[in-house]
Amino acid sequence: MSSKYPRSVRRCLPLWALTLEAALILLFYFFTHYDASLEDQKGLVASYQVGQDLTVMAAIGLGFLTSSFRRHSWSSVAFNLFMLALGVQWAILLDGFLSQFPSGKVVITLFSIRLATMSALSVLISVDAVLGKVNLAQLVVMVLVEVTALGNLRMVISNIFNTDYHMNMMHIYVFAAYFGLSVAWCLPKPLPEGTEDKDQTATIPSLSAMLGALFLWMFWPSFNSALLRSPIERKNAVFNTYYAVAVSVVTAISGSSLAHPQGKISKTYVHSAVLAGGVAVGTSCHLIPSPWLAMVLGLVAGLISVGGAKYLPGCCNRVLGIPHSSIMGYNFSLLGLLGEIIYIVLLVLDTVGAGNGMIGFQVLLSIGELSLAIVIALMSGLLTGLLLNLKIWKAPHEAKYFDDQVFWKFPHLAVGF
């Protein structure tokens, strides 16, 4: 059995990707320059470390987290890297055009790379719902549309709702989840007879998925604190995220055992639930004043995550065609919503405490912000799904879903691996 792309895609992918890369290079040539201001090297290194943490989260963490399929682990990791590399380039340009362009040129700083990496992370969260059912050419489209939609959402939220970088980037969880789910809903769903085993997890890929989860777990405090303005805010965000993810690990493992009739622990639950606390405290990580509150939120998030992993996959598989092990989409949609609700509850408590109508107005604004993020995610996701269904992309046939051999050369294997 030949391990090649169909001829048409073999022509389409390199042409499409390299033309796009050439266009990006030209845009960088004409419209960008580096920040030439004086910076001391020590400060520069410290600032770079946050960006490095985010890159590790994206490339290794999310790359390996999605690699648990028996026959699709290579593609999961490599396609994630491809999307990250492309997404960061486009996000830097887009953020620059949206926020700086009136001044003539886009100035690239370490902060803009940090922002771009976080924008690209959105795609890596979303793509979990469609990996295995799309080829690289389709993923390029998904990267471009999603990064563009997120960039515009952030600009609109910043201008209309007066939110800072941290607050508008923390919509990433909800945005990415709903974007991914709506793309998945548009793609062909049924797995034909005989291919069901491909979307099952295997021991070694599951181990690499756990490795991904560990990297995400270690670096989640960096993600939640990356865009905060002062050391005191960042310190609180790091502490609270750490407490929340620590408790969500304990909750995930014990909750997974509790949810199983024989008390066994599910790998799939644990992969995802260990991150629950970090997502749930994301929006308000710097606002939580004491460890016990962060820990309670981590506990609740862990329970919701395990509960969701137990009861939602059936529904997601039926309605959206998402395999049981791809639980990041609905996990993040639940936990992202929980995080947003926690922030809104803090505002409501302010309103009650102050008896101030203006703070009540802030609650409405926050609900409006969340609603806008969900609406834009769903609309842009549906648009992407429709685009991905176009014949020009030569999508893999349903019988070839979740199969590395469709995309990779395995000289030592004739069939399967």
């Epitope: 910076e39 970088y165 303005r229 002062s230």
Partner: antibody, heavy 129, light 108 residues
């Protein structure tokens, strides 16, 4: 004691460049964001730019965007403002100021309040042909 | 951007008078408002932050109030050293910090 000292002001022709410096002492410079604020003769205060404590992020007023660049060297405890393409309307006293933050909390939430708590004595920039 | 409007732009008062300066924001800024005092030829000085909290070392005759869009700076008993220009400043809409146009307090 806590102190900020600006330097580098002077008379310059329109279209030319100038670089202002602000030397900080008496506090941990690398833990604070820093601002430039200006005041045209007989006018009010106008915020110009801010840089985060680690230099990772910078913001500018629309009136100077693309012409002015704020930077810092934490190893030298110094803040800079590079001013290019100067115009007559840039004539002002330029102050550097420390971005101070304080936190208050109740049982469920932190509140962060910012202010400019330490100011330099100012340096005068005159743009004239 | 958020606009800050101070009133009056100047006022004359005598030592011992109670003085009130108001500041209005073009949209709600919660309590994210500061008051500064600037004497001629000097740098500004932070008086009040978070709309109503006195910065350390500031005399208790100064007080601030308000939330949302309307704020007030009150000097309960004007002293000779209080004759200066007062500015309000919002920082709700970061990354831009906006000052009011200033209120000059002069000796009657």
């Amino acid at each position: 004691q806590v102190q900020l000292v600006e330097s580098g002001g002077g008379v310059v022709q329109p279209g030319r460049s100038l670089r202002l410096s602000c030397a900080a002492s008496g506090f941990t410079f690398s833990s604070y964001g820093m601002h430039w604020v200006r005041q045209a003769p007989g006018k009010g205060l106008e915020w110009v730019a801010v840089i985060w404590y680690d230099g990772s992020n910078k913001y500018y007023a629309d009136s100077v965007k693309g012409r002015f660049t704020i930077s810092r060297d934490n190893s030298k405890n110094t803040l800079y403002l590079q001013m290019n393409s100067l115009r007559a309307e840039d004539t002002a006293v330029y102050y550097c100021a420390r971005d101070w933050v304080t936190r208050s909390s109740n049982w469920y939430r932190n509140y962060y309040y910012y202010g400019m708590d330490v100011w330099g004595q100012g340096t005068t920039v005159t743009v004239s042909s | 951007d958020i606009q800050m409007t101070q009133s009056p732009s100047s006022l004359s008062a005598s030592v011992g008078d109670r003085v009130t300066i108001t500041c209005r924001a073009s949209q709600s800024i919660s309590s994210y408002l500061n008051w500064y005092q600037q004497k001629p030829g000097k740098a500004p000085k932070l008086l009040i932050y978070a709309a109503s909290t006195l910065q350390s070392g500031v005399p208790s005759r100064f007080s601030g109030s308000g939330s949302g869009t309307d704020f007030t700076l009150t000097i309960s008993s004007l002293q000779p050293e209080d004759f200066a220009t007062y500015y309000c400043q919002q920082y709700y809409r970061t990354p831009t910090w906006t000052f009011g146009q200033g209120t000059k307090v002069e000796i009657k």
